[in-house]
């Protein structure tokens, strides 16, 4: 998959890093009417490598069914893949007016917590 | 539920905070054989109140099905409820030897990322 020398898809999908996708402006939930698409960057992927002794024990307890988490609130047994820096997103609304929303798109990611 | 004046159970389960449970040492995944139970503290709960503009748009995109996450790697649209401080846990193994494992239990939580 991909051109010669491209990475296997599974490996590319796994680790915590910056992703980018074309999304409809109207789905950003900003309240602006627009028919355009804009590039949106976000963070996803695993942070398993960054787990602490606490995380390893928490994962073990959850796996063994020895911990009863509060309803609807399962604890997280690894740091979270989250943005560490942001950038503005600009787009054109239906009135052909350019709008800019600060700190809407991620520009860097890290395993936090 | 709870005594007079206590908050409803659902509200108590909701926000990010420190939880505490009695767990079997053998389920901690430490490799020590023990028949003891210890108090294990961990963090869980929602961090929705701490969401950034990025998080709100990410949640909107995911809700609208407008974002196609990498396989097996859904992005997180709120900070994570994670330990900010830890403490050691001590227990007796089957040979009646006291063992101490540093930074195994949480002592404080926060919405990180």
């Amino acid at each position: 998959a991909g051109g010669p020398g491209s990475r296997p898809r599974a490996a590319g999908a796994r680790g915590c890093r910056l992703r980018s996708q074309l999304v409809p402006v109207r789905a950003l939930g900003l309240g602006h009417r627009s028919d355009e698409l804009v590039r949106f960057r976000f963070c996803s992927g695993s942070c398993r490598r960054a787990r602490s002794p606490h995380d390893l024990s928490l994962a073990s307890l959850l796996g063994a069914g020895a911990l009863r988490p509060p309803p609807g609130s399962r604890p997280i047994s690894q740091p979270c893949c989250r943005p560490t820096r942001y950038e503005a997103v600009s787009f054109m609304d239906v009135n052909s007016t350019w709008r800019t929303v600060d700190r809407l798109s991620a520009t860097a990611c890290g395993c936090l917590g | 539920a709870g005594g007079p004046g206590s908050r409803p159970r659902a509200a108590g389960a909701r926000g990010c905070r420190l939880r505490s449970q009695l767990v079997p040492v053998r389920a901690l995944g430490l490799g020590h054989r023990s028949d003891e139970l210890v108090r294990f503290r961990f963090c869980s709960g929602s961090c929705r109140r701490a969401r950034s503009p990025h998080d709100l748009s990410l949640a909107s995109l995911l809700g609208a099905g407008a974002l196609r996450p990498p396989p097996g790697s859904r992005p997180i649209s709120q900070p994570c409820c994670r330990p900010t401080r830890y403490e050691a846990v001590s227990f007796m193994d089957v040979n009646s030897t006291w063992r101490t494992v540093d930074r195994l239990s949480a002592t404080a939580c926060g919405c990180l990322g």
Partner: antibody, heavy 123, light 107 residues
Framework: QVQLVESGGGVVQPGRSLRLSCEAS????????LHWVRQAPGKGLEWVAF????????YYPKSVKGRFSISRDNSKNTLYLQMNSLRAEDTAVYHC????????????????WGQGTLVTVSS | DIQMTQSPSSLSASVGDRVTITCRAS??????LNWYQQKPGKAPKLLIY???GLQSGVPSRFSGRGSGTDFTLAISSLQPEDFATYYC?????????FGPGTKVDIK
Amino acid sequence: QVQLVESGGGVVQPGRSLRLSCEASGFTFSDYDLHWVRQAPGKGLEWVAFISNDGSNEYYPKSVKGRFSISRDNSKNTLYLQMNSLRAEDTAVYHCTKERDYYYDSSGSLDYWGQGTLVTVSS
Amino acid sequence: DIQMTQSPSSLSASVGDRVTITCRASQTINNYLNWYQQKPGKAPKLLIYTTSGLQSGVPSRFSGRGSGTDFTLAISSLQPEDFATYYCQQSYHSPFTFGPGTKVDIK
């Protein structure tokens, strides 16, 4: 190796329709967003349609919106462009292109292009 | 729409020359700027992706830089096979517009 082969071009009268196809091979078709780009004789490049890897998103510039329709069949590794109400200004070589990166990492850079199929709209 | 302008529209250069082509966007496009090379009768070829990424198989004499609205493509030492037309393209905001092209020919 990656190959994109367009077909379906030809001479057509104004107001008529044409359907272009692009057969893809050498990559996992359903992992990539795809585009059509055209080039009028002696002119520059003009982007005409986008479709997401799963077909959930499509987009067209104003010049073709309402007349052109992009679609894909991931089971056949084929991309299509249905062109209706054709005009003289639609005369161009039409290229099928794939994005360089997987759909979840897409930056919009187009790393493979078909050789193109010529569409001539003339009475 | 985001308008893309390129300068110069054409240039004459000799083998071994350093060549720089400029591309300007009418609105910020962050770093979503790509460069393509096209030879007569051929399909365009991706050279540089997202401002500065060198596409696999492209010689290292090609480089890109810039941010926001102003971008450049540089060829450090022009080779005979580099005589072609070069297009920039923004892929940040729909519609994804191309610059009008810069034709590089032999002096």
